[in-house]
Interface confidence: medium
Amino acid sequence: QHTCSISKVTSLLEVNCENKKLTALPADLPADTGILHLGENQLGTFSTASLVHFTHLTYLYLDRCELTSLQTNGKLIKLENLDLSHNNLKSLPSLGWALPALTTLDVSFNKLGSLSPGVLDGLSQLQELYLQNNDLKSLPPGLLLPTTKLKKLNLANNKLRELPSGLLDGLEDLDTLYLQRNWLRTIPKGFFGTLLLPFVFLHANSWYCDCEILYFRHWLQENANNVYLWKQGVDVKDTTPNVASVRCANLDNAPVYSYPGKGCPTSSGDTDYDDYDDIPDVPATRTEVKFSTNTKVHTTHWSLLAAAPSTSQDSQMISLPPTHKPTKKQSTFIHTQSPGFTTLPETMESNPTFYSLKLNTVLIPSPTTLEPTSTQATPEPNIQPMLTTSTLTTPEHSTTPVPTTTILTTPEHSTIPVPTTAILTTPKPSTIPVPTTATLTTLEPSTTPVPTTATLTTPEPSTTLVPTTATLTTPEHSTTPVPTTATLTTPEHSTTPVPTTATLTTPEPSTTLTNLVSTISPVLTTTLTTPESTPIETILEQFFTTELTLLPTLESTTTIIPEQNSFLNLPEVALVSSDTSESSPFLNSDFCCFLP
């Protein structure tokens, strides 16, 4: 009887020896084995010589085998796929001679500190190379010269500080490049050459925005639809491009693609890619967002910077998982610092605290009129919260400002909370809307959703108006939707959303703004716990009295966006904070940040 299970699928003999407590290759493997699974054993070391007689071996899985060394002293002429992931390899031997037919090599989640220059020599058929989650600090020049057929390269989650300038030379078939979560400060000029890369991941690096970044900035501008934010378990084809995820570590996390590069010298060789003198000036604007609690002690003032617009409000949403799970009643303040994106949770005990979000945006009243159209999206019955949108238009020759009214509808049996995004939108004279977003998220440890009040006022005198978005999100597992708008309607037997009282639209952007500086540094994650003894009804009655208030003087766009997780929504906007108070991270700090 074989130690391993044997089956035959797709014409190859498949032998599965996973998790058999093996310390060596089983003696009774069939000679015509085509697919061999040896994962989750305690092999320690492995030599390809032990498999040379398996002339049909095409797939070899050695993942999670506690490997500390690999010897390539035997030729496996048919091996196409080698999985060495989740081991303890600190170095790789030269692979080309032993594995000439290799098309996929996975050495992710090991302890590789460096790679020898010729480690991939001879791997002319290699199409996929996975090196993510190692300790790589640098890459040898010419590393990928032998692998001209490479399609996917994953170098994410390493400690790369720089990249060889010709790393991608000759890789005409490359379609996916993962470089996120490294220590990269810049991209060498000409790094991408003429490659057309459909999927590139560059976020969570220490991009240093100075004159050296201009090549990279221009590449981002030219390839904005190809830059993505990686999310675990989500296929890249199911995500939306997010060029704003690539941020300047030295400029309050402003997007690299909008770095202005003012004062940088121009050289004749830079003009194609680094022509930054043709970018129009943008008037300075400021929106101040204040988060305050009912304890009357803790107040943090935040400033927001305008960020580059996107065609849809959702397209630049970034989901970040909660980085701190409270174990008792407390408020958690997560401050993301630069460089390095270090997350430092600072916790302090407090009584159940209820927050109000104030966006103080003083604005010279613009004339407004309503357009009598309505927009609605129909959710799946009894599953999704309903989506209603009211949008405001400010036509050029309008005379009367009109406040908007928003109705939030919730299906009768919905168990998914209805988060509410209130968006203040007013077009700029240039017709390029500049959305900014503040996110206040109540995470799932709360047993009862906590109402969030948004008081929206108009900005300080300025002829240029900055759109502002406030996203209020309730916990994932709440079965009680949190009303955060002026009117909450629950249809008894209907799965059709109730249309808004008015739908107002903003002028469509005519151009794409590329030089706005935007920052996103700290994220306020508020975990709120209500007293267990308090009935839901009481809490609703007591604290939901102040709901989302749209002041009569306010021209606004209100969009109710269903969210199905408790992640923070971070569009390309800045919440800038610096904790200077002595007593608490929640005490005062004011900022005023201006666009270039």
Partner: antibody
Framework: QVQLVESGGGLVKPGGSLRLSCAAS????????MSWIRQAPGKGLEWVSS???????YYPDSVLGRFTISRDNAKNSLYLQMNSLRAEDTAVYYC????????????WGQGTLVTVSS | DIVMTQSPLSLPVTPGEPASISCKSS????????????LAWYLQKPGQSPQLLIY???TRESGVPDRFSGSGSGTDFTLKISRVEAEDVGVYYC?????????FGQGTKVEIK
């Protein structure tokens, strides 16, 4: 030319045993996977068992645990040991050569009839 | 197990005329690694053993007349005889050689009208 000749069929009572043999010639027997396929009277074809050139056996659920395929490369012979026979095992049993590792059958013997009846 | 379904089960033909047999599988027989469809066709003439006609959907076995052709991909396959001859009568079987257990269609009986 390739020749496959089956033998060992006959009448057997339910629960009984029978051993079929297939003598191969005209090709390098040890280099090929071999199979048994059966055909009940007036019915279609049903794969019964295969054995790779290295000696690894395969069975469908219908015969697993009752039938055993084996080969003797020195004798260029293929065998099928059938135990616990049932009435539904009644069929003509063909010995066939499998092409490479692709498991389609390029040469067939003339078949041997196995009848399971009380 | 992959179920193979043939149609029609009986096909009266006229010599010199074309004939077509369909075979459908319950799951795809396409191997994405090599883009081959693992389907074979056999003919069992009256009183004889089956003989291989086509494998990998469209590759004719040596010695098989070129009036026999196979096509299809994924789950739908077809065997065509461009001009039926008297010697083509018998039962035609399709077989998937993609995944064990190897399974056959129930057969299509081709007979002269």
């Amino acid at each position: 030319q390739v020749q496959l000749v089956e033998s060992g069929g006959g009448l057997v009572k339910p629960g009984g045993s029978l051993r079929l043999s297939c003598a191969a010639s005209g090709f390098t027997f040890s280099s090929f996977a071999m199979s048994w396929i059966r055909q009940a009277p007036g019915k279609g074809l049903e794969w019964v068992s295969s054995i790779t050139s290295a000696g690894t056996p395969y069975y469908p659920d219908s015969v697993l645990g009752r039938f055993t395929i084996s080969r003797d490369n020195a004798k260029n012979s293929l065998y099928l040991q059938m135990n616990s026979l049932r009435a539904e095992d009644t069929a003509v049993y063909y010995c066939a050569r499998s092409r490479g590792y692709e498991d389609y059958f390029d040469y067939w013997g003339q078949g041997t009839l196995v009848t399971v009846s009380s | 197990d992959i179920v193979m379904t043939q149609s029609p089960l009986s096909l009266p033909v006229t010599p010199g005329e074309p004939a077509s047999i369909s075979c459908k599988s319950s799951q795809s027989l396409l191997n994405s690694r090599n883009q081959k469809n693992y389907l074979a066709w056999y003919l069992q003439k009256p009183g004889q053993s089956p003989q291989l006609l086509i494998y990998f959907t469209s590759t004719r076995e040596s010695g098989v007349p070129d009036r026999f052709s196979g096509s299809g991909s994924g789950t739908d396959f077809t065997l065509k005889i461009s001009r039926v001859e008297a010697e083509d009568v018998g039962v035609y079987y399709c077989q998937q050689h993609y995944s064990s257990p190897w399974t056959f269609g129930q057969g299509t009986k081709v007979e002269i009208k």
